[in-house]
Interface confidence: low
């Protein structure tokens, strides 16, 4: 059930002092691009730096992830930090810098000889042997061990969406993330609000593809804001 | 095959109205997933969006420019038009039309632009 | 509306040498594309949604990039690739289509 899988010993259970947001695993999609803060130069002088904000990692650049800049701080308030070299703390993947990935709390080099074994590791822990299904999905993702080779595919486990191959974009399934297909015009989108407070999302949608963003379905402007839907329209 | 070609006065005076043409074949605006946009660039610089039309009839413009800006299309004569209002010095450069698409986007098709 | 900063603003190779340029979203976007401008002409699409190469584009130019970070490659530069290189993507909000301010290649 539902309860079982958010009950699970998973990611999201972890303590929030390394600057990963309770309740924010790394998601890796969503709002439509730049829809979240337009504007600001994050490459800027030292001098001159200006933090970031950002709702989730893919707003951030390869080289870093999204989180809360102190410990146990205002998980409303995030920037773009510098992703953690290997053998550096971590609480999620995204946290690693490319090459690496998280396991046991530590970024590990992604060996595509063991990479795929420790995943699916991580998942069957998270969820136990019970390979139910939820929503239609079985509960073991199967994970490709070609990743670093070619561009992943739909299904292919992924870090981020530069992982994925083109139309496809790096999404959570439950406590890994794969390459979904980026949503087309007239799908239903996720649209986050600005602070990045969007809890634990089991599945994520990709965000909107190339010239369509995220908004509340024109019919459904009177509805209550809890029930708005919102799809991928035209620019 | 597909060809655009752009159209306009050459010369205005300050706070004028730019009336400028796209005339095009090879495509059709009433077909599902076209547009034509226009795109500026003054002499020597960069380019610079301006505003484009879908085959629906929707608009995007410029935010910058908005106030000033307006396209409008006619499908039966295959031609998209831009006007801009208040023209000064700065609006002078060469303006291009050109074919965007729903899958993939971007600008495929260009005509030579006029000065 | 998000900023596309391209470098280097100007640039030099010799025939047959590897070119990489740049392009920075000062947000992050969906998709990249890249247009080859010469002198007296209109531009041309070479890459669409990141690293597609649009039709007739020789498979020397390559693109690819995620988030605020992309680039064009050519592989080896010939000397028809001399050119002004612009970056463009679509932002969502607000809706708007924005360019780099764009890299000039030259022939050694």
């Known amino acids: 059930t539902l309860n079982s899988v958010l009950n699970s010993n998973a990611i999201k259970n972890l303590p929030p002092p390394l600057g990963g947001a309770a309740g924010h695993p790394g998601s890796a999609v969503s709002a439509a691009p730049g829809i979240l803060y337009p504007g600001g130069n994050k490459y800027q002088t030292i001098d001159n730096y200006q933090p970031y904000p950002c709702a989730e990692d893919e707003e951030c650049g390869t080289d870093e992830y999204c989180a809360s800049p102190t410990r146990g701080g205002d998980a409303g308030v995030q920037i773009c930090l510098a992703c953690r070299k290997r053998r550096k703390r971590c609480m999620r993947h995204a946290m690693c810098c490319p090459g690496n990935y998280c396991k046991n709390g530590i970024c590990v080099s992604s060996d595509q000889n063991h990479f795929r074994g420790e995943i699916e590791e991580t998942i069957t822990e998270s969820f136990g042997n019970d390979h139910s299904t939820l929503d239609g999905y079985s509960r073991r993702t199967t994970l490709s061990s070609k990743m670093y080779h070619t561009k992943g595919q739909e299904g292919s486990v992924c870090l981020r969406s530069s992982d994925c191959a083109s139309g496809l974009c790096c999404a959570r399934h439950f406590w890994s993330k794969i390459c979904k297909p980026v949503l087309k015009e007239g799908q239903v989108c996720t649209k986050h609000r600005r602070k990045g407070s969007h809890g634990l999302e089991i599945f994520q949608r990709c965000y909107c593809g190339e010239g369509l963003s995220c908004r509340i379905q024109k019919d459904h402007h009177q509805a209550s804001n809890s029930s708005r839907l919102h799809t991928c329209q035209r620019h | 095959q597909v060809t655009l070609k752009e159209s306009g006065p050459g010369i205005l005076q300050p706070s004028q109205t730019l009336s400028l043409t796209c005339s095009f074949s090879?495509?059709?605006?009433?077909?599902?997933?076209?547009?034509v946009g226009w795109i500026r660039q003054p002499s020597g610089k960069g380019l610079e969006w301006l505003a484009h039309i879908w085959w629906d009839d929707v608009k995007r413009y410029n935010p910058a420019l908005k106030s000033r800006l307006t396209i409008s299309k006619d499908t039966s004569s295959s031609q998209v038009f831009l006007k801009i209002a208040s023209v000064d010095t700065t609006d002078t450069a060469s303006y291009y039309c050109?074919?965007?698409?729903?899958?993939?986007?971007?600008?495929?098709?260009w005509g030579q632009g006029t000065l | 509306q998000i900023v596309l900063t391209q470098s280097p603003v100007i640039m030099s190779a010799s025939p047959g040498e590897k070119v990489t340029m740049t392009c920075s979203a000062s947000?992050?976007?969906?998709?990249m594309y890249w247009y080859q401008q010469k002198p007296g002409s209109s531009p041309r699409l070479l890459i669409y949604d990141t690293s597609n190469l649009a039709s007739g584009v020789p498979v020397r130019f390559s693109g690819s990039g995620s988030g605020t970070s992309y680039s064009l490659t050519i592989s080896r530069m010939e000397a028809e690739d001399a050119a002004t290189y612009y970056c463009?993507?679509?932002?969502?909000?607000?809706?708007?289509?924005?360019f780099g301010a764009g890299t000039k290649l030259e022939l050694k």
């Open positions: 050109s074919r965007i698409a729903r899958s993939p986007t971007g600008f495929a098709y």
């Open positions: 090879g495509f059709s605006l009433s077909t599902s997933g076209m547009g």
């Open positions: 947000s992050s976007v969906s998709y």
């Open positions: 463009q993507q679509w932002s969502s909000y607000p809706p708007a289509l924005t």
